[in-house]
C-alpha cells in the first residue's frame, strides 16, 4: 500500500494506491483512492507513467479530458466516473500488454488540496491449472496443464499423504511457447501416483500463484483450482 500526501501550497490530501498485476490480453485495474470532495467539478484526476511523455488519463470537471493523452494509451483507459465523487480514482486499462508494466502516479487535486501516490504495475500471464489422470500412461500418472503463463513459472508437486516429500525426481515439466510468442503453456506430469491421495500441482511466478488439486479414489475423482495474485501491496 502506498499512501501519498499533498504538495506545498494548498492543504495535502491522502491518496492511496495498491500495487497490482495485469493479465496480458485482458482488461486491468490500477487502484487509487483519495479523500473525497463534495463537488465533482472540483476534482481533477491525472494518471501518469514513468518514462511516458503524455498523460495516461485525465479526468476533470466531471468528464474525461484526453487531449494530452499519450498515443500508447489512446482508446484504452477509463476511470469509473460514477465513483469519483466517493474517492475512487482507479483506472481501467483495456487489453493489458507487457509494455504496460512500470511505475504509475495517481495525482489528485480537490478543493481540499493535492496529493499523489505511486503504483508499481506488473504485467504477465497467469491461468488456472487443471489436473487430470493420464490414462494413456503405462503407470498411474497425473497431468497438470495451464494454458498461459509469463514469465516462466516454477512447478512443484505436493501430496497430502507424503507431506514434505520432494517429487522432482518423479515429475517432468515442460513449457511450450504459445502462438503469440510471449506466453507459454505449462505441462507437468507426475508419475507413480497412489490411489486415495490428494495431489497438488503448484505453479508460481513473481506475479501469481496457482494450485490445482486432484483427489483420486477408487470410486471418484475430485478436482479443485485456486489462483492468487502475489503483489497486491498498498502504498
Amino acid at each position: 500500500l502506498i499512501i501519498g500526501f499533498g504538495i506545498s501550497g494548498r492543504h495535502s490530501i491522502t491518496v492511496t494506491t495498491v500495487a497490482s498485476a495485469g493479465n496480458i490480453g485482458e482488461d486491468g485495474i490500477l487502484s487509487c483512492t483519495f479523500e473525497p470532495d463534495i463537488k465533482l467539478s472540483d476534482i481533477v484526476i491525472q494518471w501518469l507513467k514513468e518514462g511516458v511523455l503524455g498523460l495516461v488519463h485525465e479526468f476533470k470537471e466531471g468528464k474525461d479530458e484526453l487531449s494530452e493523452q499519450d498515443e500508447m494509451f489512446r482508446g484504452r483507459t477509463a476511470v469509473f466516473a460514477d465513483q469519483v465523487i466517493v474517492g475512487n480514482a482507479s483506472l481501467r486499462l483495456k487489453n493489458v500488454q507487457l509494455t504496460d508494466a512500470g511505475t504509475y502516479k495517481c495525482y489528485i487535486i480537490t478543493s481540499k488540496g493535492k496529493g499523489n501516490a505511486n503504483l508499481e504495475y506488473k504485467t504477465g500471464a497467469f491461468s488456472m491449472p487443471e489436473v487430470n489422470v493420464d490414462y494413456n500412461a503405462s503407470s498411474e500418472t497425473l497431468r497438470c496443464e495451464a494454458p498461459r503463463w509469463f514469465p516462466q513459472p516454477t512447478v512443484v508437486w505436493a501430496s497430502q499423504v507424503d507431506q514434505g516429500a520432494n517429487f522432482s525426481e518423479v515429475s517432468n515439466t515442460s513449457f511450450e511457447l504459445n502462438s503469440e510468442n510471449v506466453t507459454m503453456k505449462v505441462v507437468s506430469v507426475l508419475y507413480n501416483v497412489t490411489i486415495n491421495n490428494t495431489y497438488s500441482c503448484m505453479i508460481e511466478n513473481d506475479i501469481a500463484k496457482a494450485t490445482g488439486d486432484i483427489k483420486v479414489t477408487e470410486s471418484e475423482i475430485k478436482r479443485r483450482s485456486h489462483l492468487q495474485l502475489l503483489n497486491s501491496k498498498a502504498s
Epitope: D64, G75, A78, A81, S179
Partner: antibody
Framework: EVQLVESGGGLIQPGGSLRLSCAAS????????MNWVRQAPGKGLEWVSV???????DYADSVKGRFTISRDNSKNTLYLQMNSLRAEDTAVYYC??????????WGQGTTVTVSS | EIVLTQSPGTLSLSPGERATLSCRAS???????LAWYQQKPGQAPRLLIY???SRATGIPDRFSGSGSGTDFTLTISRLEPEDFAVYYC??????????FGQGTKLEIK
Amino acid sequence: EVQLVESGGGLIQPGGSLRLSCAASGFIVSRNYMNWVRQAPGKGLEWVSVIYGSGRTDYADSVKGRFTISRDNSKNTLYLQMNSLRAEDTAVYYCARDADYGLDVWGQGTTVTVSS
Amino acid sequence: EIVLTQSPGTLSLSPGERATLSCRASQSVSSSYLAWYQQKPGQAPRLLIYGASSRATGIPDRFSGSGSGTDFTLTISRLEPEDFAVYYCQQYGSSPLYTFGQGTKLEIK
C-alpha cells in the same frame, strides 16, 4: 493486408446447430479481442460474443449457454458454435477485431437463417 | 446495462450541408470507449471515430466526433454523396461488453 473472412452460414431448422468460421490474415488473432456481432434483417447491430487475448470469453445474455466462441491459434481462425438455434437468431453474423481503437476490422458477414 | 439512444432516427439533408448526429448514454461512458461506425446497404460497418474524437485510419477530416459523459456527437461538416448511410455509436466496457445505439439513417433530401 489485414482481412477477416467469415463462412459457415446457411439455412437451419429451429433447435439445430451451426458453426461459423472467421479466417484472419495480416494479423494475429490471439493478440486481439475478437468479436462476433450480428444484424437481424432490417435491424441494428447487436454484439454477440468476445474472446479476449487471454482466451477468456464473454457473451450477450441472449446467447449465453447456447453459443460458444473459440479460436484456433495455429489456424489464426475464430469460431462461433451455435446450438439450440431460434428464429430470432436469424441475422448476418460479422466477426470483428477490437485493436483497442474500437472494432476496426470487420468481415463481410455470413447469413444465418433459422426457419422450419 | 448502458443504453445508447441515437437521434434523430432519420436525418434528411442535401450534399454540401452539415450533419449533426447525437448519441446519448443512460449513464456515463468513458470517452476512450466511445466509437462511431458507418454502414452502407449490403456492407459491413466501418469504424469512423474512436475515443469519442479520434478519426480512424483513412477517414476524411470532414468527420469529427465530440462529447463526454453521457452526450456524444458525430459531425459531418460538408456532406458528400457517399456519406449517406446508417451511423451507429457504440460503447465498450460494461455489461454487455459492447453496446450499440439503434442507428441514425442519413438520407438524401
